[in-house]
Interface confidence: low
């Protein structure tokens, strides 16, 4: 999906008002310096591409974040403010329903959400490079 035509300011507002705090809630009890940043992004569409990938794509050691509160709100924000995004996610949603809900927060998931926090911060900056 091409995130170029999203309403970035509306997505930023959604992040500031709620998604940011949901990410922090998920990370509660984890020291802010425990993980090194390994994922970056250069402009807002790129940031959203990376955010979507880390939030909704299963990775080794972290099967699914998609049912977490921050993920559901991220999905809603993208669906509302990125034209055509919902249509591209129908297959992904069906697959997501088949996964079991994560019972424990693995260290890999914490690391992944830490990366998400960094990506969101870069997205949130108004003067991103190459934008």
């Amino acid at each position: 999906y091409d995130f170029t035509n999203c309403d970035f300011e509306k997505i930023k507002a959604a992040y500031l008002s709620t998604i940011s705090k949901d990410l922090i809630t998920y990370m509660s009890g984890t020291k802010s310096t425990e993980f090194n940043n390994t994922v970056s992004c250069s402009n807002r569409p790129h940031c959203l591409t990376e955010i979507q990938s880390l939030t909704f794509n299963p990775t080794a050691g972290c099967a699914s974040l998609a049912k977490e509160m921050f993920a559901m709100k991220t999905k809603a924000a993208l669906a509302i403010w990125c034209p055509g995004y919902s249509e591209t996610q129908i297959n992904a949603t069906q697959a997501m329903k088949k996964r079991r809900k994560r019972k424990v927060t693995t260290n890999k998931c914490l690391e992944q959400v830490s990366q998400l926090q960094g990506l969101w911060r870069r997205f949130n900056r108004p003067l991103l490079k190459q934008q």
Epitope: K12, L16, S17, S20, K21, L23, I24, S32, T33, F35, N36, N37, S114, Q117, G118, W120, R121, N124, R125, P126, L127, K129
Partner: antibody
């Protein structure tokens, strides 16, 4: 251990310039956003400026915009504040502070220097 | 620009609970950080992201944030807690850091 050490303070006449430096050690300087915060005698904390971890962006308080310039040299682990056209109201203790911008959703200063005094007086 | 309002002073007896407030328009939608500053010393972060505490800070320090008010709570206050306390946010609309005016905590 992790520390920030400011230098360059002193007494200067109004309209003149001064350059403050902050030497960082004990941590990965290049991964942190860096700020200057000042405190006038008997007053509260006032934020002055920020520079991102990679130096790509800077922001300034309205009271210093156009007069102060924040820079960093990640190869030398140093932060600088060039202060031009100084005024009496710039008299304060100047602190450098780091903010782990990749991890907190909004800047929080988890390490401060001891401060350096700048006095602007004729 | 965004404004944070703190009471100039708060007094509390040793062993009691001190509550220092920080008011701002819809501050609950922002992340609030709190600093302790003792005379002649640099500030020290005591609470960040509304309610998280750096590892070296005692559990007696806690924070909350909702609506138009953030609160720093210090339980079982000790004489050593006497200091100035500042709240702080990042104002995303201006890309400025904003500090409250500070609150002097006096332990009676």
């Amino acid at each position: 251990q992790m520390q920030l050490v400011e230098s360059g303070g002193g007494v200067v006449q109004p309209g003149r310039s001064l350059r403050l430096s902050c030497a960082a050690s004990g941590f990965a300087f290049r991964t942190y956003g860096m700020h200057w915060v000042r405190q006038a005698p008997g007053k509260g904390l006032e934020w002055v400026a920020v520079i991102w971890d990679d130096g790509s962006n800077t922001h300034y308080a309205d009271s210093v915009k156009g007069r102060f310039t924040i820079t960093r040299d990640n190869s030398k682990n140093t932060l600088n504040l060039q202060m031009n056209s100084l005024r009496a109201e710039d008299t304060a203790v100047y602190y450098c502070a780091r903010a782990p911008q990749w991890y907190l959703s909004a800047e929080a200063f988890d390490l401060w220097g001891q401060g350096t005094m700048v006095t602007v007086s004729s | 620009s965004y404004v944070l309002t703190q009471p100039p002073s708060v007094s509390v007896a040793p062993g009691q609970t001190a509550r220092i407030t920080c008011g701002g328009n819809l501050i609950g939608s922002k992340l609030v950080h709190w600093y302790q500053q003792k005379p002649g010393q640099a500030p020290v972060l005591v609470v960040y992201d509304d309610s998280d505490r750096p590892s070296r800070i005692p559990e007696r320090f806690s924070g909350s944030n909702s609506g138009n008010t953030a609160t720093l709570t210090i339980s079982r206050v000790e004489a050593g807690d006497e200091a100035d306390y500042y709240c702080q946010v990042w104002d995303h609309s201006s890309d400025h850091v904003v500090f409250g005016g500070g609150t002097k905590l006096t332990v009676l």
